[in-house]
């Protein structure tokens, strides 16, 4: 049994890091393998992650971590029984994929303005809380070409757009994702999408 593709890990910089790897053949990850991880710190304890299958030869493990900070570094040991298959390390702050924003809501009752709001996925005491920027994707269910991205580079989790910038009388969907420049993160997954019917009063022609 050999590792074909070494584990690569990403952290949500809060409580979970996800590691994925590939074996050289079909593997029952949860019964045959264990991923041991330990913070390089005074008094830290070793933890064991039981991997799940991710395709025939692929495995994925969700590592639970407390109080993730930029100074943290973890040792990783992948075991098959008594055999050490791979040894490595992982610094969560250097491989961050933020959590997806939540509670995306479209407020249509503001005069001819659409107000989109969502929730920051981090608590205020997490460093990323004040460092997320967002991308909002709005698209028409009727017209695949009517697809737009709005970059929200300020901290407030909201976006205002004129309803007239979208077509009236048709349904739209929106979703939002986040990233943080400070840790050069990847983009988060998209939030679940929300749907609304766009209607506004056309101005009278003179």
């Amino acid at each position: 049994m050999k590792v074909l593709q070494e584990p690569t890990c990403v952290s949500d910089y809060m409580s979970i890091s996800t590691c994925e790897w590939k074996m050289n053949g079909p593997t029952n990850c949860s019964t045959e393998l264990r991923l041991l991880y330990q913070l390089v710190f005074l008094l830290s304890e070793a933890h064991t992650c039981i991997p799940e299958n991710n395709g025939g030869a692929g495995c994925v493990c969700h590592l639970l971590m407390d109080d993730v900070v930029s100074a943290d570094n973890y040792t990783l040991d992948l075991w098959a029984g008594q055999q050490l298959l791979w040894k490595g390390s992982f610094k969560p702050s250097e491989h961050v994929k933020p959590r997806a924003p939540g509670n995306l809501t479209v407020h249509t009752n503001v005069s001819d303005t659409l107000l989109l709001t969502w929730s920051n996925p981090y608590p205020p005491d997490n460093y990323l809380y004040n460092h997320l920027t967002y991308a909002v994707n709005i698209w028409s269910e009727n017209d695949p070409a009517d697809f737009r991205i709005y970059n929200v580079t300020y901290l407030e989790p909201s976006l205002r757009i004129a309803a007239s910038t979208l077509k009236s009388g048709i349904s739209y969907r929106a979703r939002v994702r986040a990233w943080a420049q400070c840790y050069n993160t990847t983009w988060s997954e998209w939030s679940p999408s929300t749907k609304w019917h766009n209607s506004y009063r056309e101005p009278f022609e003179q």
Partner: antibody
């Protein structure tokens, strides 16, 4: 919000022991290390040791080895610091502080006076 | 005796800028992360800067930290009378046995 509430001031005689408590609230108690530091009157901060509330393991500064004991009670989210064989130089304010590489939150401190 | 050396005192007028240095060595500041703590008179220390240059939420951007080699600096701009306090740097001694270290402390007086 995070709170670290320490026990009240103590006056002890040389040779005696003192046990200071620090009750934590507002966060997951076992997820964060707890440090103890002290500050003698008019002096700077001095690190004493650290406890991992999850398993109860400890590490102490060499200066206090053999005299200090740190424990925790997960049922009450409280950590304790006991210092024995007290001498006058141990007169200080004793602080518990939550954190790992740096100390996010500090208790208000407990003044321990050692005097005959 | 702390191996992190700070000036015993610094002073400046309100509105001015002041810097406080923290000098260490390759086995501590040079190989670890620096934090800064503010201790107002009669109170417990409070985290001001961590990870060399990051501010916890609620700390104004008048406070900034930097690190270069084996020394670190805390800068305070737009000094206010409420900034009058003792300031301590902190880091880790990475040579066994690893342990946290505090600087000698600096008394800031706002004139």
């Amino acid at each position: 919000q995070v709170q670290l509430v320490q026990s009240g001031a103590e006056v002890k005689k040389p040779g005696a022991s003192v046990k200071v408590s620090c009750k934590a609230s507002g966060y997951a108690f076992t997820s964060y290390y707890m440090h103890w530091a002290r500050q003698a009157p008019g002096q700077g901060l001095e690190w004493m040791g650290i406890i991992n509330p999850s398993g109860g393991s400890t590490s102490y500064a060499q200066k206090f080895q053999g005299r200090v004991t740190m424990t925790r009670d997960t049922s009450t989210s409280t950590v304790y610091m006991e210092l024995s064989s007290l001498r006058s130089e141990d007169t200080a304010v004793y602080y518990c502080a939550r954190g790992k590489w740096w100390l996010y939150n500090w208790g208000k401190g407990t003044l321990v006076t050692v005097s005959s | 005796q702390s191996v992190l050396t700070q000036p015993p005192s610094v002073s400046a007028a309100p509105g001015q800028k002041v810097t406080i240095s923290c000098s260490g060595g390759s086995s501590n500041i040079g190989n670890s992360y620096v934090s800064w703590y503010q201790q107002l008179p009669g109170t417990a220390p409070k985290l001001l800067i961590y990870d060399n240059n990051k501010r916890p939420s609620g700390i104004p951007d008048r406070f900034s930290g930097s690190k270069s080699g084996t020394s670190a600096t805390l800068a305070i701009t737009g000094l206010q009378t409420g900034d009058e306090a003792d300031y301590y740097c902190g880091t880790w001694d990475t040579s066994p046995p690893t342990k946290p270290l505090f600087g000698t402390g600096t008394k800031l007086t706002v004139l």
